[in-house]
């Protein structure tokens, strides 16, 4: 009876996500067979989040909307470890929007999920950000410095990275 009600709950939760994510990849969390964490297929997972590399080229606003309809946001990078995981799935000759912007052009950078911007946990390329007109952040590869962030014009289409919390069932 307990297992039956747990299964019913799982099915209803899965139905919530089915509209945008018809297929989920789930793994057992810890030792308890009843706790599963899932990411949409083919998203990748790291710690408590799922990540999707969008190869379509769109402006920052359209990229954020695109993530949003999938129940996600443009990626918020909180640690060096998280960035190191993300870059494993990126192409060196491409640039990808982050969920970081400065819409007022006053160098008040803000993350899309309202995570406080912490200057100590940023990975700007040297000399960046360097232009008040460039109000959106990308991650890209520079041969001298490897992967880092750069400010660019928000309306210039780029690839992007979406991030969402894992789905627990």
């Amino acid at each position: 009876n307990f297992m039956y009600s747990k299964t019913v709950k799982r099915l209803s939760k899965l139905r919530e996500y089915q509209q945008y994510h018809p297929s989920l990849t789930c793994v057992m969390e810890g030792k308890d067979i009843e706790d599963w964490s899932c990411c949409p297929t083919p998203w990748t997972s790291f710690q408590s989040s799922c990540y999707f590399i969008s190869t379509g080229m769109q402006s920052w606003t359209k990229s954020q909307k695109n993530c949003s309809v999938m129940g996600a946001d443009l990626v918020v990078i909180n640690t060096r470890e998280e960035q190191d995981f993300i870059i494993q799935n990126l192409k060196r000759n491409s640039s990808y929007f982050l969920g970081l912007s400065d819409p007022g052009g006053r160098r008040h950078w803000q993350w899309v999920d309202q995570t406080p911007y912490n200057e100590n946990v940023t990975f700007w390329h040297s000399g960046e950000p360097n232009n008040l007109d460039e109000r959106c952040a990308i991650i890209n590869f520079r041969s001298s410095e490897e992967w880092g962030w750069n400010d660019i014009h928000c309306h210039v289409p780029q690839k992007s990275i979406c991030k969402m919390k894992k789905i627990y069932i």
Partner: antibody, heavy 121, light 111 residues
Framework: EVQLLESGGGLVQPGGSLRLSCAAS????????MSWVRQAPGKGLEWVAT????????YYPDSVKGRFTISRDNSKNTLYLQMNSLRAEDTAVYYC??????????????WGQGTTVTVSS | DIVLTQSPDSLAVSLGERATINCKAS??????????VNWYQQKPGQPPKLLIY???NLESGIPDRFSGSGSGTDFTLTISSLQAEDVAVYYC?????????FGGGTKVEIK
């Protein structure tokens, strides 16, 4: 007072090249993103190129990508547009304009008087 | 690319009367409460002049008989009381995503 003065237009044969200049004054040119916009005779407006203040980022529509190059010399307060492999459809008045950001978008707030480019054999 | 369709192509209005120009985008140009549509006026032999930015913000130095409205995909430029000096072609433009695109223009004349 902001002033933008384009020059360098003229008659050129198809396949030929031309370099347009835009001399800027009345504002701190080196801090402004700049753009070129063109207007074919009796037609509407078409964005051609944009360059950021430092000159390290440039953007073009597909119609001119690979043929046109926007550049700038901040020490001379001058914006350039190098146009190669010119076609009849590039015939237009070419305007330079200052770019002003508006949140995630922008406006073209000051425009020069334009310089005319005619591509014809 | 985002296509902007202006209507009508031309408009004849009596002096002192209202003129209304429409601009329809092929997809939404809104984000976070702002619309990325601008309006320009171009008089014969002159460069375009910015009138309205962000769909409804009047550019400094522009008379307040000009106003803009709309959101999403539908935008309107209104001249509340047409003056002789308003005879021109009016263009909408989107700056939400490159390539920036302009509407085809609306010619405003005196009836």
């Amino acid at each position: 007072e902001v002033q933008l003065l384009e020059s360098g237009g003229g008659l050129v044969q198809p396949g030929g090249s031309l370099r347009l200049s835009c001399a800027a004054s009345g504002f701190t040119f080196s801090t402004y993103t700049m753009s070129w916009v063109r207007q074919a005779p009796g037609k509407g407006l078409e964005w051609v190129a944009t360059i950021n203040s430092g000159g390290d980022n440039t953007y073009y529509p597909d119609s001119v990508k690979g043929r046109f190059t926007i550049s700038r010399d901040n020490s001379k307060n001058t914006l350039y547009l190098q146009m190669n492999s010119l076609r009849a459809e590039d015939t237009a008045v070419y305007y330079c304009a200052t770019y002003r950001p508006y949140y995630y978008g922008s406006v073209l707030d000051y425009w020069g008087q334009g310089t005319t480019v005619t591509v014809s054999s | 690319d985002i296509v902007l369709t202006q209507s009508p192509d031309s408009l004849a209005v009596s002096l002192g009367e209202r003129a209304t120009i429409n601009c329809k985008a092929s997809q939404s140009v809104d984000y976070d409460g702002n619309s990325y549509v601008n309006w320009y006026q171009q008089k014969p032999g002159q460069p375009p002049k910015l009138l309205i930015y962000g769909a409804s913000n009047l550019e400094s130095g522009i008379p307040d008989r000009f106003s803009g409205s709309g959101s999403g995909t539908d935008f309107t430029l209104t001249i509340s009381s047409l003056q002789a000096e308003d005879v021109a072609v009016y263009y909408c433009q989107q700056s939400d995503e490159d390539p920036w695109t302009f509407g085809g223009g609306t010619k405003v004349e005196i009836k």
